[in-house]
């Protein structure tokens, strides 16, 4: 039969993953680490280190594993049920509005400001005005003091787009 697309099809169909593995679909869905076969009768395993699926699904294909970019470190490898977890290297961070690349953290705050937050893998150092305590906008300062920052350690997952 040919498949017609409806609006409700556009929302991913997912549910929480129990621990057992199955070789045939349950209620038309395959478990994490698998995708559904073309005829819908079988669940086919994803290829370890190459692709993955995280939820019960009726996907025709597993999702390609993210490969960490240069400037990133791999915190955990891709498995059949979980994507690679990448993190910006020490001294760099990834902003929410530009998640595709790691940017260098500033080494210090502009004159008249004091550092209140360290460089982490997901944020630049945070500077506030000494007097008012208001945050600095994040623009690159013309003059920097020699206040160095220490990078943070928590992990942030890579974006799914790879």
């Amino acid at each position: 039969e040919s498949a017609l697309i409806t609006q409700q099809d556009l929302a991913p169909q997912q549910r929480a993953a129990p621990q057992q593995k199955r070789s045939s679909p349950s209620e038309g869905l395959c478990p994490p680490g698998h995708h559904i076969s073309e005829d819908g009768r079988d669940c086919i395993s994803c290829k370890y280190g190459q692709d993955y699926s995280t939820h019960w699904n009726d996907l025709l294909f597993c999702l390609r594993c993210t490969r960490c970019d240069s400037g990133e470190v791999e915190l955990s490898p891709c498995t059949t049920t979980r994507n690679t977890v990448c993190q910006c290297e020490e001294g760099t961070f990834r902003e929410e509005d530009s998640p595709e690349m790691c940017r260098k953290c500033r080494t210090g705050c502009p004159r008249g400001m004091v550092k209140v937050g360290d460089c982490t893998p997901w944020s630049d150092i945070e500077c506030v005005h000494k007097e008012s305590g208001t945050k600095h906008s994040g623009e690159v300062p013309a003059v920097e003091e020699t206040v160095t920052s220490s990078p943070g350690t928590p992990a942030s997952p890579c974006s799914l787009s790879g």
Epitope: D9, L60, F61, L63, S159, S161
Partner: nanobody
Framework: EVQLLESGGGLVQPGGSLRLSCAAS????????MSWFRQAPGKGLEFVSA????????YYADSVKGRFTISRDNSKNTLYLQMNSLRAEDTAVYYC??????????????????WGQGTLVTVSS
């Protein structure tokens, strides 16, 4: 972010062949599954064929199985659909799409997916 441009459509006689291309620009689509849909005049959107990111797992609708072949060249960022033994009922606008994956019913899956503008295939004598 990603632009998909189909080409290769045209008028062909029943039994004839056409090869459609879908060129991606803006960023590489080698991480994405890709597919072909079609819409016949006055009909809904039909899922025709799909191919995974690596090009080694395919899907075909029953209506085109054995006649159409989907393939991709990741080095050229291009998807193809070789259509043989064309029939009048294959007349439609053909669209390509890219997504992280596609559900069995054809719905694109993932945070981002992209569609082309379509190319018209007319099968008529």
């Amino acid at each position: 972010e990603v632009q998909l441009l189909e080409s290769g459509g045209g008028l062909v006689q029943p039994g004839g062949s056409l090869r459609l291309s879908c060129a991606a620009s803006g960023r590489t689509v080698s991480n994405y599954a890709m597919s072909w849909f079609r819409q016949a005049p006055g009909k809904g959107l039909e899922f025709v064929s799909a191919l995974n990111w690596g090009g080694d797992t395919t899907y075909y609708a029953d209506s085109v199985k054995g006649r159409f072949t989907i393939s991709r060249d990741n080095s050229k960022n291009t998807l193809y659909l070789q259509m043989n033994s064309l029939r009048a009922e294959d007349t439609a606008v053909y669209y390509c799409a890219a997504a992280q994956s596609f559900r069995r019913g054809g719905a694109p899956y993932g945070d981002n997916y992209w569609w082309g503008q379509g190319t018209l295939v007319t099968v008529s004598s």
